[in-house]
């Protein structure tokens, strides 16, 4: 079986996640691709996903998480914006490919995401260096409902310093003007 | 093997600008991330900002945000970096740095500095 | 701002010595730190990235250890060529940061 593997990233809260999802551009160019998070013992559960089939760098975005496919460069870019300590878990990329299981991108992120010193430079958001607006033209794409039980069977261990985000959390309110500070990133 | 060529030696007066060039060979250019570092005479590494072309915009450190704009032209493989408002303190030689995408195994996007340019001396003095 | 302390400062050792140079960031970085070396009047020169990941073309008496906020650059065998200045830097989250730098002597 493969292993699966693990990347942990430490930030603050206002914070934002960017990391890029590599795939073999020619086999996944036009798939669906989605962002999940997985939590112990559960299905994996999708929390925003591109639109079908996916579109060329057309950002699609759900409540703080922004999904942009890069067909021409096989490269999935998720960020998740001003993040709250509830954000914490380990989260991954898939590619829908109905009828068959979703094709997980490896590694998983382990998202530990920790109380920011308010006015402290580099903690939160008044500290970052970019500005960015989300595109008006940004979609909620309708993801498929199942996922793969091939990507629960084991279960990683869980950080120490993970905090299992909330159903309630999921819900993300919609951000227009968010100030990114990647992990570049 | 990436290679990185900067633009040559400038002597500016405080209060204008410089734009500084680095042409790369060899790598994925568009989705690989370009950084700038500055060093000044007898300090350390001071990252300025950088860029992923295919991603458009730059982001800055705090302390030269306003005075510095980094871009890119994926038509050339080029990389540019502008800093205005010159003063005495800006004398250094600064550094273009390039992060060869890689593929599979890591999200991780500006990976470590990989390859450097060989470093453009910039000397404000009235 | 991630605030990196390396120590030592400065550091004199002899050919074939086995030299540890640290670094410390002042908040949680996972694994996301890089070594530099850098010579009088040349560009620095990457030597690890990801904390234990030697970049191509380094030899293999350089290596890096550690994790979260302590991490260690180990030179097992100094040669001649390896006296210089080195730097970590980490790339956790913007802005990124770099160490002051150890220099290396020697002795």
């Known amino acids: 079986a493969t292993k699966l593997t693990e990347e942990k990233y430490e930030l603050k809260e206002g914070q934002t996640l960017d990391v890029k999802c590599d795939y073999t551009l020619e086999k996944f160019a036009s798939s669906q691709k989605a962002w999940q998070i997985i939590r112990d013992g559960e299905m994996p559960k999708t929390l925003a996903c591109t639109e079908r089939p996916s579109k060329n760098s057309h950002p699609v975005q759900v409540g703080r998480i922004i999904l942009e496919d890069y067909h021409d460069h096989g490269l999935l870019r998720v960020r998740m914006v001003n993040l709250q300590v509830e954000d914490s878990g380990l989260y991954q990329c898939v590619i829908y490919q109905p009828p068959k299981e979703p094709h997980m991108l490896f590694d998983r992120i382990r998202l530990v995401v920790t109380k920011g010193f308010s006015g402290t430079p580099g903690s939160n958001e008044n500290s970052t260096q970019n500005v960015y607006k989300i595109p008006p033209t940004t979609t909620k794409a309708l993801c498929p409902l199942y996922t793969s039980p091939r990507t629960v069977t084991q279960a990683p261990p869980k950080s120490t310093a993970d905090v299992s985000t909330p159903d309630s959390e999921i819900n993300l309110t919609n951000v227009t003007d968010i100030i990114r500070v990647p992990v570049f990133n | 093997q990436v290679q990185l060529v900067q633009s040559g030696a400038e002597v500016k007066k405080p209060g204008s600008s410089v734009k500084v060039s680095c042409k790369t060979s060899g790598g994925t250019f568009s989705s690989s991330a370009v950084s700038w570092v500055r060093q000044a005479p007898g300090q350390g590494l001071e990252w300025m900002g950088g860029?992923?072309?295919?991603?458009?915009?730059?982001d800055y450190a705090q302390k030269f945000q306003g005075r510095v704009t980094i871009t890119a032209d994926a038509s050339t493989s080029t990389g540019y970096m502008e800093l205005s408002s010159l003063r005495s303190e800006d004398t250094a030689v600064y550094y273009c740095?390039?992060?060869?995408?890689?593929?599979?195994?890591?999200?991780?996007?500006?990976?470590?500095?990989?390859?450097w340019g060989q470093g453009t001396t910039v000397t404000v003095s009235s | 701002d991630i605030q990196m302390t390396q120590s030592p400062t400065s550091l004199s050792a002899s050919v074939g010595d086995r030299v540890t140079i640290t670094c410390r960031a002042s908040?949680?970085?996972?694994?996301?730190l890089a070594w530099y070396q850098q010579k009088p009047e040349k560009a620095p020169k990457s030597l690890i990235y990801a904390a234990s990941s030697l970049q191509s073309g380094v030899p293999s008496r350089f290596s890096g250890s550690g994790s979260g906020t302590d991490f260690t650059l180990t030179i097992s065998s100094l040669q001649p060529e390896d006296f210089a200045t080195y730097y970590c830097q980490q790339y956790n989250s913007y802005p990124y940061t770099f160490g002051q730098g150890t220099k290396l002597e020697i002795k």
């Open positions: 740095a390039f992060t060869p995408r890689y593929r599979g195994s890591s999200h991780h996007y500006y990976y470590a500095l990989g390859v």
């Open positions: 860029i992923t072309p295919i991603f458009g915009t730059a």
């Open positions: 908040q949680g970085i996972s694994s996301w």
